[in-house]
């Protein structure tokens, strides 16, 4: 806490300018009017204040706005934003995307800090949903942003926002997150033709159900093995050998290199060896010829 001391004669700040960098902490506290600081926040960023001096300026704003800063001040916080705590930010009501961008710019190149996470949370909650422009902005600054959200949070993403998602934005998403995002992507891209649709939906396929994979096999998509390996195991298991062959097209030969890895390994175990042999890839581990395959789900339903 800085002591309240009178401002020395002639030192009263008329405007926020570079002369203030020579002020001691107590002089800043005594000589800079909080209201003046608030109206000229845009100048603070251009002045090389020390961290200690920034602490004083923040203190002055906290006193002026105990209930939280107005957006006109927040937008121009600049490096002063780095001094804010999540508790400070929870008091804010940020509605402008420009404000969000300005603050994210300050933290650019760094990991998402608790302050940034709180800011984003406040912003998104204020908007009610994660719209396309917001998602565009957030993923531009933090490619992993989408995958940092819980499935519950992702449920507020409208299908229209999916257009802003790039493949790299989904790199760290787990199956539960893709389960939520995939139906939205399917809805968003539903009016595209076959090949264009596949290009867009490909990154989301880790959330696709069996039926959609079977349907994709009808579109001559030639799915690559990297994409196939990211599919849900439970969605791949019911696919027939013919469907996998049609889905992968010329890439079907890549199954051999992946036969010990999921989901290929588990899929092989579900196929008749005779059917696997027709691929001519030397895949082993299928159900031997003559063995009966029991449909246990039917048995459970009857018991």
């Amino acid at each position: 806490e800085v002591e309240k001391t009178a401002c020395p004669s002639g030192k009263k700040a008329r405007e926020i300018d570079e002369s203030l960098i020579f002020y001691k902490k107590w002089e800043l506290e005594a000589c800079v009017d909080a209201a003046l600081l608030a109206t000229q926040m845009d100048r603070v960023n251009a002045i090389p204040f020390t961290y200690e001096q920034l602490d004083v300026l923040k203190h002055k704003l906290d006193e002026l706005y105990p209930q939280g800063y107005p957006e006109s001040v927040i937008q121009h916080l600049g490096y002063l934003f780095l001094k804010m705590s999540p508790e400070d930010i929870r008091k804010w009501n940020v509605t402008s995307l420009e404000t969000l961008k300005a603050l994210l710019e300050v933290n650019k190149g760094h990991e998402m800090s608790p302050q940034v996470a709180t800011l984003i949370d406040r912003f998104v909650k204020g908007r009610g949903q994660l719209d396309k422009d917001t998602l565009d902005t957030l993923t531009a600054f933090y490619p992993g942003y989408l995958c940092s959200l819980s499935p519950e949070e992702l449920s507020s993403v409208p299908p229209s926002s999916i257009w802003a998602v790039r493949p790299q934005d989904l790199d760290t998403c787990d199956p539960r997150q893709l389960d939520v995002l995939y139906p939205k992507a399917r809805l968003a891209f539903q009016n595209m033709n076959g090949s264009e649709y596949f290009v867009k939906i490909q990154s989301f396929l880790g959330g696709a159900p069996t039926e959609d994979l079977k349907a994709l096999s009808q579109q001559n998509v030639s799915m690559d093995l990297a994409t196939f390996m990211k599919l849900r195991t439970d969605a791949v298991l019911p696919l027939t050998v013919a469907e996998v062959q049609k889905l992968l097209g010329p890439h079907v030969e890549g199954l051999k290199a992946e036969e010990r890895h999921r989901p290929v390994r588990d899929w092989i175990l579900r196929q008749r060896q005779d059917d696997l042999d027709t691929l001519g890839l030397g895949l082993q581990g299928g159900i031997p010829n003559g063995y009966l395959v029991l449909d246990l789900s039917m048995q459970e339903a009857l018991s």
Partner: antibody, heavy 117, light 95 residues
């Protein structure tokens, strides 16, 4: 034993409607895409419709699009083909077939539709 | 054709169908069965006297030793792209 049994064929006037059925047994119906294929009086085979295993996706050639609707009831193991605005050129033997990836691996015995005034 | 003959039936596609070519047999009573899929793969239960080959746009079905039960009409079908289409059929008759 895998069985597909069609029914519902008959004589219909041009512009009329008819619904064909196919009862399936001997396999897990809900796992497979199903199709209708017809054979014209000139003995040409024509693919008519395909439906995905869960019934979400349907596929038709231009010749029947908007007039025919394929559907399936996985609880009853039944496949259907609702035909409307029928034309004389729809006269054919209609086969129900199981579809696997890119081929029709099992066929029913067929049911006959005649469209004539 | 005569019983015991080697019979070859051809099928030509209007464009490359990437080996997604299937063969069906229709008996005189109307029963249809899949014989061969993906150019040369025998469907389960099909006798080994049936074989097939081809690539690109040209495909063929061969019956190495014609038997009475093979008297039928044979259809080819492309499964490469929708709409799936069938050939006009080749009817085998005994001389």
């Amino acid at each position: 034993e895998l069985l597909l049994v069609e029914s519902g064929g008959g004589l219909v006037k041009p512009g009329g409607s008819l619904k064909l059925s196919c009862a399936a047994s001997g396999f897990t119906f809900s796992d497979y895409f199903m199709s209708w294929v017809r054979q014209t009086p000139e003995k040409r085979l024509e693919w008519v419709a395909t439906i995905s295993n869960g019934g979400t996706y349907t596929y038709y050639p231009d010749s029947v699009k908007g007039r025919f609707t394929i559907s399936k009831d996985n609880a009853k193991n039944n496949l259907y083909l609702q035909m409307s605005s029928l034309k004389s050129e729809d006269t054919a033997m209609y086969y129900c077939a199981r579809f696997d990836g890119y081929y029709f691996d099992y066929w029913g015995q067929g049911t006959t539709l005649t469209v004539s005034s | 054709a005569s019983l015991g003959d080697r019979v070859t039936i051809s099928c030509r596609a209007s464009q490359d169908i990437s080996n997604y070519l299937n063969w069906y047999q229709q008996k005189p009573d109307g029963t249809v069965k899949l014989l061969i899929y993906y150019t040369s793969r025998l469907h389960s239960g099909v006798p080994s006297r049936f074989s097939a080959s081809g690539s690109g746009t040209d495909y063929s079905l061969t019956i190495s030793n014609l038997e009475q039960e093979d008297i039928a009409t044979y259809f080819c079908q492309q499964g490469n792209t929708l709409p799936y289409t069938f050939g006009g059929g080749t009817k085998l008759e005994i001389k």
